[in-house]
């Protein structure tokens, strides 16, 4: 399995998505586990509802939640109030009997909030009405993108509050592609700050 890297800011929420074939994994419960060492076991953190028809109900274990869109084929894990100790290797799993299939290997990286210890400088960000709770950096395993762009909303309004920034952020980071993320909130399109940085992190 390749490894997908999701990057989040300490103190914020990080949302991890694991797509899967909904027919292949039909009727199966899912789980999120933490890899203990390179060859060690994967320790269960949280699993979906015991009743498969209730899989899309959000289940919590501490600060970690899981919910499964069984029709769309997407398992979503939310790590609330991300902390440095949350960094590490995880797996999304599909359960059948005592067996578990790996849907995706995930490397969680935790960034410090740079505004806690440095000036935001001349950066302009969406104002008070915008929410960054679900913002995350997803490092995909696809080839690096040829160009990068910033959503137009990033240059339109002054910084209304201390919104978190990745520590490596600068106006036009090389190889950084900012994609538009669908969100149920009322943010304008392009302002949801879902960064997709294309870099190869294969761990065959």
């Amino acid at each position: 399995h390749n490894t997908t890297v999701f990057q989040g800011v300490a103190g914020q929420s990080l949302q991890v998505s694991c797509p899967y074939d909904s027919m292949k994994h039909w009727g199966r419960r899912k789980a999120w586990c933490r890899q203990l060492g390179e060859k060690g076991p994967c320790q269960r953190v949280v699993s979906t509802h015991n009743l498969w028809l209730l899989s899309f109900l959000r289940r919590w274990n501490g600060s970690t939640a899981i919910t499964d869109d069984t029709l769309g084929g997407t398992l979503t894990i939310t790590l609330r109030n991300l902390q440095p100790h949350d960094a590490g290797l995880y797996q999304c799993q599909s359960l059948h009997g005592s067996e578990a299939d790996t849907l995706r290997k995930v490397l969680v990286e935790v960034l410090a909030d740079p505004l806690d210890h440095r000036d935001a400088g001349d950066l302009w960000f969406p104002g008070e009405s915008e929410s960054f709770e679900d913002a995350h950096v997803e490092h995909s395993i696809s080839r690096p993108s040829q160009g990068s762009h910033l959503p137009s909303c990033l240059s339109k309004e002054p910084l209304g509050r201390r919104n978190p920034l990745p520590t490596h952020f600068h106006p036009s980071p090389p190889g950084l592609h900012l994609s538009h993320q669908d969100s149920s909130s009322q943010r304008p399109l392009g302002c949801s700050l879902a960064w997709t940085e294309a870099r190869d992190t294969s761990t065959q």
């Epitope: 209730l54 109900l57 959000r58 919590w60 919910t67 069984t70 029709l71």
Partner: antibody
Amino acid sequence: QVQLQQSGPGLVKPSQTLSLTCAISGDSVSSSSAAWNWIRQSPSRGLEWLGHIGYRSKWYNEYAVSVKSRITINPDTSKNQFSLQLNSVTPEDTAVYYCARGMYGSVPYKEGYYFDIWGQGTLVTVSS
Amino acid sequence: DIQMTQSPSSLSASVGDRVTITCRASQGISSDLNWYQQKPGKAPKLLIYAASNLQSGVPSRFSGSGSGTDFTLTISSLQPEDFATYYCQQYTDESMTFGQGTKVEIK
């Protein structure tokens, strides 16, 4: 509005099969946003969830551990209804049986599941 | 299975009284709890879902609170039509279970 109408015999002999039907109006048994449940109530056991069925690309059913080996819930899409079959009944299975719709709450997001519409109930007595 | 224990099993109250019914789960169920009202010869009726959310059409005098193992249903000002039996129900476990009921009678 959504309504559930139950039908079936009120008297079943021990060791035989209890069969009830629940006809749905105002919703579809094939809805992917609902589950269709059977629940029973007796003085000795109180309210007891028996199982449910739901359509998620294919039909899927799940049953309470206490009746798992004896129960079947089936859909009938042509009549927009679902049925309960409980095998090898004993006097302990004497109860009022209800069908109910299971729905998912939108507040809080992805956290609510409840029985919002119920059938009128059918008293089933198991006796020879 | 998760056991749901309601208290009291019955209570007597007058119209206008504030009534509180509690429900305790044998293990933590987060907010996975519903409240129903049942009148004699009728099916249960949903009042509160996910511990604290009022079902559409239910009077605002009904409210629910709690999380984990301890939950409360409160009727702020009891009305004549509220004399009934009330049940809690959890949906955390693979076998959803109900409390044994609390009967609210006229004093």
